[in-house]
């Protein structure tokens, strides 16, 4: 067990803070909730503290919760490939470019680390080149989320990892808005981290609303499990 992994044996409180600017529309989001890495489970609620969110909530899911991939459930035979937990408590910087097909792009930078006993994800997001009447600024996305796989490779040069994946957002007219994600994670501390073999995270997310909440908000339930590396031969013959 890596030293960081020991921090995830129980339920951990999570705080998410995002400051965003998309085509000059500035906004802030606060999110709170909890994660349980034993089950790869995340339960979070987000509110826009600046009024109405200028972009659809589903476009921010990867920035919020795929940001805290340290809550992914890594099966026993894959624990030596869990970069995310091994970087804790000092944490990691996560940078992404998210390119929306035939529309603009988000660039995000996040610091994910423990502050006391709380796992904090602080994010800055800049969005440019979006069409005012497009699927994103025109709020044409359905309020739901598809299952996805996040493909992870080691980045030995930077002592971190890279990830590439494509998100499929459902549009109200029945079509799909694609969002290409290019992700890089580097540790904040200088302690040893686990550099993984190629594998993927299987992610299932459910979006809902709080019937008592008057503010613009999103409730998120997510399950994430690592896969893609089989038991070694020594495991098979045990």
């Amino acid at each position: 067990m890596s030293k960081g992994e020991e921090l995830f044996t129980g339920v951990v409180p999570i705080l998410v803070e995002l400051d965003g600017d998309v085509n000059g529309h500035k906004f802030s989001v606060s999110g709170e909730g909890e994660g349980d890495a034993t089950y790869g489970k995340l339960t979070l609620k987000f509110i826009c503290t600046t009024g109405k969110l200028p972009v659809p909530w589903p476009t921010l899911v990867t920035t919020f919760s795929y940001g805290v991939q340290c809550f992914s459930r890594y099966p026993d035979h894959m624990k030596q490939h869990d970069f995310f937990k091994s970087a804790m408590p000092e944490g990691y910087v996560q940078e992404r470019t998210i390119s929306f097909k035939d529309d603009g792009n988000y660039k995000t930078r996040a610091e994910v680390k423990f502050e006391g006993d709380t796992l904090v994800n602080r994010i800055e997001l800049k969005g440019i080149d979006f069409k005012e009447d497009g699927n994103i600024l025109g709020h044409k996305l359905e309020y739901n989320y598809n299952s996805h796989n996040v493909y992870i490779t080691a980045d030995k040069q930077k002592n971190g990892i890279k990830a590439n994946f494509k998100i499929r957002h459902n549009i109200e007219d029945g079509s799909v808005q694609l969002a290409d994600h290019y992700q890089q994670n580097t540790p904040i501390g200088d302690g040893p981290v686990l550099l993984p073999d190629n594998h993927y995270l299987s992610t299932q997310s459910a979006l809902s609303k709080d019937p008592n909440e008057k503010r613009d908000h999103m409730v998120l339930l997510e399950f994430v499990t690592a896969a893609g590396i089989t038991h070694g031969m020594d495991e098979l013959y045990k």
């Epitope: 339920v11 951990v12 606060s30 999110g31 709170e32 909730g33 909890e34 339960t43 509110i47 709380t118």
Partner: nanobody
Framework: QVQLQESGGGSVQAGGSLRLSCVAS????????MYWYRQAPGKACELVSL???????TYADSVKGRFTISRDDAKNTVYLQMNSLEPEDTAVYYC?????????????????QGQGTQVTVSS
């Protein structure tokens, strides 16, 4: 779904006492910082008290020595014992759960908060 349900409000004479309760569901109560704040008509909302998971408490100067916050993690409940009540304590009282233990903080920014319970103190 996370729910916070306050109870125990009512009308009392100045100098009287009330005990507010807030039951939480849908969250792992023991890991959250629990707050009470209040909103009087036409006034800015005011943080009243905070209790963190280890039991450490913080109070607004206006209620120090009169109000006591406590928690029972087995019952997923936070309490506010209010003694020596004054007309200035009249407000709607809300409980809130947070993963951040900031004091002070804006009470409009709580992600998880209840619907409130009315406390009226008459002279």
């Amino acid at each position: 779904q996370v729910q916070l349900q306050e109870s125990g409000g009512g009308s009392v004479q100045a100098g009287g006492s009330l005990r507010l309760s807030c039951v939480a569901s849908g969250l792992t109560f023991s890991i959250y910082r629990m707050y009470w704040y209040r909103q009087a008509p036409g006034k800015a909302c005011e943080l009243v008290s905070l209790i963190i998971p280890d039991g450490t408490t913080t109070y607004a100067d206006s209620v120090k020595g009169r109000f006591t916050i406590s928690r029972d993690d087995a019952k997923n409940t936070v309490y506010l014992q209010m003694n020596s009540l004054e007309p200035e304590d009249t407000a709607v009282y809300y409980c809130a759960a947070s993963t951040a233990g900031n004091w002070p903080r804006a009470c409009t920014d709580f992600v998880y908060q209840g619907q409130g319970t009315q406390v009226t103190v008459s002279s």
